[in-house]
Amino acid sequence: IIDGYKCKEGSHPWQVALLKGNQLHCGGVLVDKYWVLTAAHCKMGQYQVQLGSDKIGDQSAQKIKATKSFRHPGYSTKTHVNDIMLVRLDEPVKMSSKVEAVQLPEHCEPPGTSCTVSGWGTTTSPDVTFPSDLMCSDVKLISSRECKKVYKDLLGKTMLCAGIPDSKTNTCNGDSGGPLVCNDTLQGLVSWGTYPCGQPNDPGVYTQVCKYKRWVMETMKTHR
């Protein structure tokens, strides 16, 4: 997260880190005791999932292995559409005040809605600085019409844009797959953005979760 702030401790109990060994690979969101939602471009053969801590690499955090993941069948590495994936944990999480599932959306929030994005991604760009603490940024949803002025044909119908006019605050490497939460519901998953990160008036681009609720529910049901 560029130009963000340290999240209030325990305020994001659904936030997970997908680790490759001990190294941050992507963010993710707990949606069920067995399931983590993340970006399809974060796919690996297996994952070490850290839950229940705002500190990356926290020894006291829950760490659960995951060996199965299900990309959206329509994910395209060419157009980056349908950048969403479910990761099935090998064992259920122990729910607590520090570990909770996020609320999936009942509807799509409109442009102008205030939201918070979080992650352990680099706080500087192009040189990388990975924080140990979970970082947050407060952003507002931007209309597709406005966002298309910046990204033109790269912006797909199920992509959501967010940012703050003239501000550098945004997502970056390592934040991918992490949550954009608006009015206590998951509205977006970090998908992509301009590099170097933090260029004013280049919004962050997210997978619009409200358009995928049926797929999420059906996939979890199929692979119970």
């Epitope: 060419k78 991918s176 998908s191």
Partner: antibody
């Protein structure tokens, strides 16, 4: 200041495998922001992209060479390597390693990068 | 694959001249074009990326323009150090990165 240096044999026999290594100094290859690529230039000719690799090991190859190319990365040594099998005289060229600077991060990153830092190049001749 | 066609292949000019090199893509590449300068026996050096963004440390006499399929590299006032071969490269497609055939700028 980032520097790249190619190394490997200058002479390779036809049908054998060409192996080159690029050593990166002045910066870490494991920065998740960048791609690391190989480009070649036959004598008196233009530039041809061979392929690239990300710090995590995701590879992208030129389809015309894909069946013969392997690019790998060794983050512990701050190096990445090229292997080109079944070489012929047509593979004689100056081989450059280079860093790919992305225009986007995340899902869109690997299609939009340009080579911003290059090695000096190493000449490889394929001859018996 | 996207083909990149540069013109002219050779250009004779004098110090102080305004020089223009054109690069055409076989299909639209938006603004995903870079320009490189290469001197004999040396590696290419990045001049311009994203069609018109000047790489850090490159003199302001170099400029790039264009989008879609037609692009231009302009040297506003040619200096002795500018005699070299120039290549364009497209990096905005799902096919491989491809370079133009090069334009050699030589002394008139």
């Amino acid at each position: 200041q980032l520097q790249l240096q190619e190394s490997g044999p200058g002479l390779v026999k036809p049908s054998e495998t060409l192996s080159l290594t690029c050593t990166v100094s002045g910066g870490s290859i494991s920065s998740s922001s960048y791609y690391w690529g190989w480009i070649r230039q036959p004598p008196g000719k233009g530039l041809e992209w061979i392929g690239s690799i990300s710090y995590s090991g995701s590879t992208y190859y030129n389809p015309s060479l894909k069946s013969r190319v392997t690019i790998s990365v060794d983050t512990s040594k701050n190096q990445f390597s090229l292997k080109l099998s079944s070489v012929t005289a047509a593979d004689t060229a100056v081989y450059y390693c280079a860093r790919g600077a992305p225009t986007y991060f995340g899902a869109a990153s690997h299609y939009y990068y340009y080579m911003d830092v290059w090695g000096k190049g190493t000449t490889v001749t394929v001859s018996s | 694959d996207i083909q990149m066609t540069q013109s002219p292949s050779t250009l004779s000019a004098s110090v102080g001249d305004r020089v223009t090199i054109t690069c055409r893509a076989s299909q639209s590449i938006s603004s995903w074009l870079a320009w490189y300068q290469q001197k004999p026996g040396k590696a290419p050096k990045l001049l311009i990326y994203k069609a018109s963004s000047l790489e850090s440390g490159v003199p302001s006499r170099f400029s790039g323009s264009g989008s879609g399929t037609e692009f231009t590299l302009t040297i506003s006032s040619l200096q002795p150090d500018d005699f070299a071969t120039y290549y364009c490269e497209q990096y905005g497609s799902y096919s491989p990165l491809t370079f133009g055939g090069g334009t050699k700028v030589e002394i008139k």
